[in-house]
C-alpha cells in the first residue's frame, strides 16, 4: 500500500491515526459530494498502518450541516476524457460501450425472465392454496376478508393478473358479485407491490444504495396501503367504484376485439417456456370449487392437444339425472345415460425442463424459486455494476438532469404528470407493473432516479397495468366481457382515486415520507426490511384472514382495540413532533415505555445474537464470490464482507465516526481535501484482511 503523504497542518496526535485508537474526531461527511454509495465500512488493517489523513481545516471548522442522505450521489467519471484518447483508445471505448450495452440488455432480459419464473415458482408453491382462499364463502359479506385474500393470493402467486383473472372468471360464473370482487382487486393491487420490494432487498449490501432502493420500492407499497385505507371504507359506504363502472359498462356497446398485445412477452416467452410452463386454469378451477382440479398438477405436460366432442355413456345417480328418458338405460345395477363429453387427446408434450421429471408441484416450485432468486440477484448485481460503470460524468449528468429536472416555471407541476404518463406507457409496453417497478428499483438505488421522481413513475405503472387489463377485458369472450371489463375499470378507477388522494398536492404525498422513513430504518437495521415484508404482506393479512373466519364479533373485538392503539400512537407522535408543550412532560417522548417498545436497538441485539453464527461462513462465501466477480469484471478490489469489517462498521457508526477507506489505485486524499471534501467510502478499496 502506498504510504500516505505527510501534511503540514496534519493533526498533531498520531495515536488518532492508529488502528485501535480510542477515539477519532467526529467528522461529518459531505454527502452531497459523495462519489460512491458503498457501505460506511472500515477496512481492517494491520497494526500501525495509517488510516486516511483528515484535513485539520475540516476538523477545526464548526461541524458542517449534515446533508440529506436522500441527495443523489455524484457519479463521477474517473476515466480519461474522450478528447484525450487516441484513435485506438476511441475505438476501444466505443466497443466497450457497445459491449456494456449488450451486457446490460442481456442481464435486463434475464432479470425480466427471472421475474416471470419467480412468479411461476410462487404459483407452484402456493397457487393451489391461493385458489382455495377464493372458495371461502365469507368473501361475499366481508370486504376486509376480500381485501386480505387479494393480498395473500397475489403474494403467493406473484402475479396480480392471475388473481384478477380468477376473480373475473368467478364473477362471470356468478360465484362472486362485482361488489365482493372490488376489495379483492384492491388487495391484488397491494400484493403486486411485493415484487419490487423483494428486488430492493437484493441491494442490501450497500447501506446508502439500499436506503434509496428500499424506499423507492416501498413507496409503491405505501401508496397502495394508504389508498386502500381510505378508499375501501368509502367503497363499502358508497359503492362508488361499482356504480361508476357499471354505468360505463352499460353505456357502451362493446364488441370483443383483438387480444391485448403481448409486447415484452414476445421476447421473454421463448426463454421462460423452456424453463417451465403452467396450466393457470387449475388455480381458477380450485377457486371455483372444482374438486378434480385439486389433484391436477400446475406443471403443463401436454402443450398440443386435440379436443374432440364425443357422446359418452356415463352413470348417473337416478333417472332424474337423465338427459331424457329415452337416453337412459340400466346395466342391471347402475343407471346410464349419454352425455356430450369433450375428450382431450394429447398430441405433443411441452418442451420445458420439468416435463419428464414428474416431480410434485412443491418440489418444482422450490427448485425454481431458488434458481430464479439467484438469477434475479445475480442479474441485479450485474445491472447495478454495469450501470455504475456507464453512468459516470457527462452521461450521468445528462440522464439525471433529464429524468429528475422539472419543467421551467410555471409548468414545473406538469413534470410529475408526465412521469405518470411515462410510467403508464412503459408498463403498457412491458405488460407488467412488477417488471417496470422492479427495473426502476436498482436505478433508484444507484442514484439515477430520485424517489420524488420514482413516485409518479410508480403511480403511472399502476395505471399502466390497469390499461393492459382493460385491453385484455375487451379481448375476452362474450360471456366474461362485461364482468372482466367492469373489474378492470374498478381497478383503473381505484388507482385514479388513489393518485388524486396522494399525488396532486405535495403535502399529501405521504407515501414518499413514509417510504423514506422506512428506508432510513432499514438502512440502519437491515433485518427490519425482511420483518416489514413478513409483517405487511403475510402476518397482517393472515391475521385478518384468521379473525375474519372466526366471525365479525371476533374481528371487531380484536380489530377495534388495535386500531384505537394505532390512532393513539399516531396522534401522540404528531403532537410530540409539532407541539410537544401541549403534552405532559412524561408524554413528550417515548422514554416512559420500555426501550424495546420504542427502539429497535434491543431487537437488533437479539437478532444479531441469532444471526451471528451464520455471518462468518456467509461472509467467507461472499468474499470468495466478490473476488471472483471482481476478477471477471477486471477490477480486483476490496470486498467489504468480512465479519471484522462489519463489526468495525457497526461499532464506529455507533460512535458517530465516519468510516473511511483509502482508494486503492488513486491516492486522491490531498486533492479531495484541497476541495474541502471528505469522501465517503469507495467500493474500490484495498482490503488488507484478504
Amino acid at each position: 500500500m502506498a504510504p500516505w503523504p505527510e501534511l503540514g497542518d496534519a493533526q498533531p496526535n498520531p495515536s488518532k491515526y492508529l488502528e485501535g485508537a480510542t477515539s477519532q474526531q467526529p467528522i461529518t461527511p459531505d454527502k452531497s459530494k459523495e462519489t460512491n454509495k458503498t457501505d460506511n465500512t472500515e477496512v481492517p488493517v494491520t497494526k500501525f498502518e495509517l488510516l486516511p489523513t483528515y484535513s485539520t481545516a475540516t476538523l477545526i471548522e464548526e461541524p458542517t450541516e449534515v446533508d440529506d442522505p436522500w441527495n443523489l450521489p455524484t457519479l463521477q467519471d474517473s476515466g480519461i476524457k474522450w478528447s484525450e484518447r487516441d484513435a485506438k483508445g476511441k475505438i476501444l471505448c466505443v466497443f466497450q460501450g457497445i459491449g456494456r450495452l449488450i451486457l446490460l440488455l442481456g442481464f435486463l432480459y434475464f432479470f425480466v425472465c427471472s421475474l416471470d419464473v419467480l412468479s411461476s415458482a410462487f404459483q407452484l408453491v402456493g397457487g393451489k392454496m391461493a385458489g382455495q382462499f377464493f372458495s371461502n364463502s365469507s368473501i361475499m359479506s366481508n370486504p376486509l376478508l376480500g381485501l386480505v385474500i387479494g393480498v395473500l393470493v397475489t403474494v403467493f402467486v406473484q402475479s396480480s393478473s392471475t388473481s384478477t383473472s380468477i376473480v373475473v372468471s368467478m364473477v362471470a360464473s356468478s360465484l362472486l358479485t362485482v361488489r365482493a370482487a372490488i376489495p379483492i382487486i384492491m388487495g391484488a393491487n397491494i400484493g403486486t407491490s411485493i415484487t419490487n420490494t423483494i428486488v430492493a432487498l437484493m441491494q442490501v449490501g450497500d447501506r446508502s444504495e439500499f436506503r434509496r432502493a428500499f424506499a423507492g420500492a416501498t413507496v409503491h407499497d405505501f401508496f397502495n396501503w394508504l389508498s386502500v385505507l381510505v378508499l375501501l371504507p368509502v367503497e363499502v359506504a358508497t359503492h362508488y367504484l361499482e356504480v361508476v363502472t357499471q354505468l360505463i359498462v352499460e353505456s357502451f356497446h362493446f364488441k370483443n376485439g383483438e387480444d391485448a398485445p403481448d409486447l415484452l412477452k414476445v421476447i421473454t416467452k421463448p426463454f421462460t417456456k423452456l424453463i417451465v410452463q403452467l396450466d393457470k386454469k387449475v388455480i381458477s378451477q380450485i377457486a371455483m370449487n372444482d374438486e378434480t382440479a385439486k389433484n391436477k398438477s400446475l406443471v403443463k405436460i401436454w402443450c398440443k392437444t386435440f379436443t374432440n366432442m364425443t357422446q359418452m355413456n356415463v352413470t348417473v345417480p337416478s333417472m332424474a339425472n337423465c338427459t331424457s328418458p329415452s337416453l337412459c338405460w340400466t346395466d342391471g345395477i347402475q343407471i346410464w345415460t349419454m352425455k356430450n363429453v369433450t375428450y382431450k387427446e394429447n398430441i405433443a408434450k411441452c418442451q420445458h425442463i420439468f416435463v419428464n421429471f414428474h416431480l410434485p408441484d412443491l418440489a418444482v416450485g422450490i427448485i425454481l424459486l431458488i434458481i430464479s432468486l439467484l438469477v434475479l440477484c445475480g442479474c441485479l448485481i450485474m445491472i447495478v455494476k454495469i450501470l455504475g460503470s456507464v453512468l459516470k460524468g457527462q452521461v450521468a449528468t445528462v440522464i439525471k438532469k433529464t429524468i429528475n429536472t422539472d419543467f421551467p416555471f410555471p409548468f414545473a407541476w406538469l413534470t410529475g404528470y408526465l412521469a405518470i404518463l411515462v410510467g403508464a406507457g412503459m408498463t403498457f409496453i412491458v405488460q407488467s407493473s412488477s417488471v417496470f417497478t422492479s427495473a426502476l428499483t436498482p436505478l433508484i438505488g444507484i442514484g439515477v432516479i430520485t424517489i420524488e421522481r420514482a413516485y409518479p413513475l410508480t403511480l403511472g405503472s399502476n395505471i399502466g397495468t390497469t390499461t393492459t387489463a382493460i385491453l385484455a377485458a375487451l379481448a375476452s369472450p362474450g360471456n366474461t366481457l362485461r364482468s372482466s371489463l367492469q373489474i378492470a375499470l374498478c381497478h383503473f378507477f381505484f388507482n385514479i382515486s388513489g393518485i388524486l388522494l396522494w399525488y396532486p398536492i405535495p403535502f399529501t404525498r405521504l407515501p414518499i415520507r413514509m417510504a423514506k422513513g422506512l428506508g432510513n430504518i432499514s438502512a440502519k437495521y437491515r433485518w427490519f426490511a425482511i420483518f416489514y415484508l413478513i409483517i405487511f404482506f403475510f402476518l397482517i393479512p393472515l391475521t385478518v384472514f384468521g379473525l375474519s373466519l372466526a366471525g365479525w364479533p371476533v374481528l371487531v373485538g380484536v380489530g377495534v382495540p388495535v386500531v384505537f392503539i394505532i390512532i393513539l400512537v399516531l396522534c401522540l407522535r404528531l403532537l410530540q413532533s409539532r407541539c410537544p408543550r401541549v403534552l405532559p412532560k412524561k408524554l413528550q417522548n417515548w422514554n416512559f415505555l420500555p426501550l424495546c417498545m420504542h427502539s429497535l436497538k434491543p431487537w437488533d441485539a437479539v437478532i444479531s445474537k441469532f444471526t451471528g453464527p451464520f455471518q462468518m461462513p456467509c461472509c467467507c462465501c461472499c468474499r470468495v464470490c466478490c473476488r471472483v466477480c471482481c476478477l471477471l469484471c477486471g477490477c480486483p478490489k476490496c470486498c467489504r464482507c468480512s465479519k471484522c469489517c462489519q463489526d468495525l462498521e457497526e461499532g464506529q457508526e455507533a460512535q458517530g465516526v465516519p468510516v473511511k477507506a483509502p482508494e486503492t489505485f488513486d491516492n486522491i486524499t490531498i486533492s479531495r481535501e484541497a476541495q474541502g471534501e471528505v469522501r465517503a467510502p469507495d467500493s474500490k478499496t484495498e482490503c488488507t484482511a484478504l
Epitope: N313, M319, P325, S326, L327, C328, W329, T330, D331, G332, I333, Q334, I335, W336
Partner: antibody
Framework: QVQLVQSGAEVVKPGASVKVSCKTS????????MHWVRQAPGQGLEWIGA????????AYNQKFKGRVTLTADKSTSTAYMELSSLRSEATAVYYC????????????WGQGTLVTVSS | DIQLTQSPSFLSASVGDRVTITCKAS??????VAWYQQKPGKAPKLLIY???TRHSGVPSRFSGSGSGTEFTLTISSLQPEDFATYYC?????????FGQGTKLEIK
C-alpha cells in the same frame, strides 16, 4: 374365449336352500356385471338380479327380493346365487349371464342349472 | 315394470323366407332393447343389442330396427338353423324384462 360354467342340477326339498355357482374364465371377472335369469319349464325368461363383482354391488327384481342372495368371489372368479325358502314354483333352469359393459344386454350365458323343488 | 309384448307368439315359415318378429314396450325404452335366440335345452344367445347392433359372430341376415316402443327383428332369408324361440329384452330400467317369446317353426 369367454366361458361360464354352472354347477350341476339340484333337487331340494321345499323350504330348503340351494346355492348355484357360476365359474367364469376368459375375461376379467370384476369388469362386467353378472346377471341371473330363470326359466320355468315351458315358460319365458325372467330376470332375477345382477351383481357387479368389482364392488359387490347388487340389484334384485322385487319379485325375488328376500329369497335370493347374489355373491361373488373375486379370487376364484365365481359368482353365486343362493335361493332360500324354496317352494315348488321355484323349479326352473337358472342361468348366469355376463352383462355387456355399460348396458343390460347379456352376451355370454352359462349352460343353466336345473333346480327341482320337490318333497 | 315395463311389459314387453311379442307378436306373433308362434310363426311358421320355410327356409329362405323373410321373417319379421315385433316387440312392443308398455313405455318408451329408447333403443335399450336386445334380441335373443334360444334353442330347446340350450342357453339363450345374444343376437342384437341397442335395437339395431348385431353381436359379434351373428350372421348378417339378422337385423333389428325400431326405437321408443316398437321394435322388430328381421331374418332376411331363413336358414334351417334359425328355427328356435326368439326373445326381446329391455334394459331401459330395472327390473330388466323379457318378452314372452316367439316360437319360429318350420312350415
Amino acid at each position: 374365449q369367454v366361458q361360464l360354467v354352472q354347477s350341476g342340477a339340484e333337487v331340494v326339498k321345499p323350504g330348503a336352500s340351494v346355492k348355484v355357482s357360476c365359474k367364469t374364465s376368459g375375461y376379467t371377472f370384476t369388469t362386467n356385471n353378472m346377471h341371473w335369469v330363470r326359466q320355468a319349464p315351458g315358460q319365458g325368461l325372467e330376470w332375477i338380479g345382477a351383481i357387479y363383482p368389482g364392488s359387490g354391488a347388487t340389484a334384485y327384481n322385487q319379485k325375488f327380493k328376500g329369497r335370493v342372495t347374489l355373491t361373488a368371489d373375486k379370487s376364484t372368479s365365481t359368482a353365486y346365487m343362493e335361493l332360500s325358502s324354496l317352494r315348488s314354483e321355484a323349479t326352473a333352469v337358472y342361468y348366469c349371464a355376463r352383462g355387456m359393459y355399460g348396458h343390460g344386454a347379456m352376451d355370454y350365458w352359462g349352460q343353466g342349472t336345473l333346480v327341482t323343488v320337490s318333497s | 315394470d315395463i311389459q314387453l309384448t311379442q307378436s306373433p307368439s308362434f310363426l311358421s315359415a320355410s327356409v329362405g323366407d323373410r321373417v319379421t318378429i315385433t316387440c312392443k314396450a308398455s313405455q318408451d325404452v329408447g333403443t335399450a332393447v336386445a334380441w335373443y335366440q334360444q334353442k330347446p335345452g340350450k342357453a339363450p344367445k345374444l343376437l342384437i343389442y341397442w335395437a339395431t347392433t348385431r353381436h359379434s359372430g351373428v350372421p348378417s341376415r339378422f337385423s333389428g330396427s325400431g326405437s321408443g316402443t316398437e321394435f322388430t327383428l328381421t331374418i332376411s332369408s331363413l336358414q334351417p338353423e334359425d328355427f328356435a324361440t326368439y326373445y326381446c329384452q329391455q334394459y331401459s330400467s330395472n327390473p330388466l324384462t323379457f318378452g314372452q317369446g316367439t316360437k319360429l317353426e318350420i312350415k
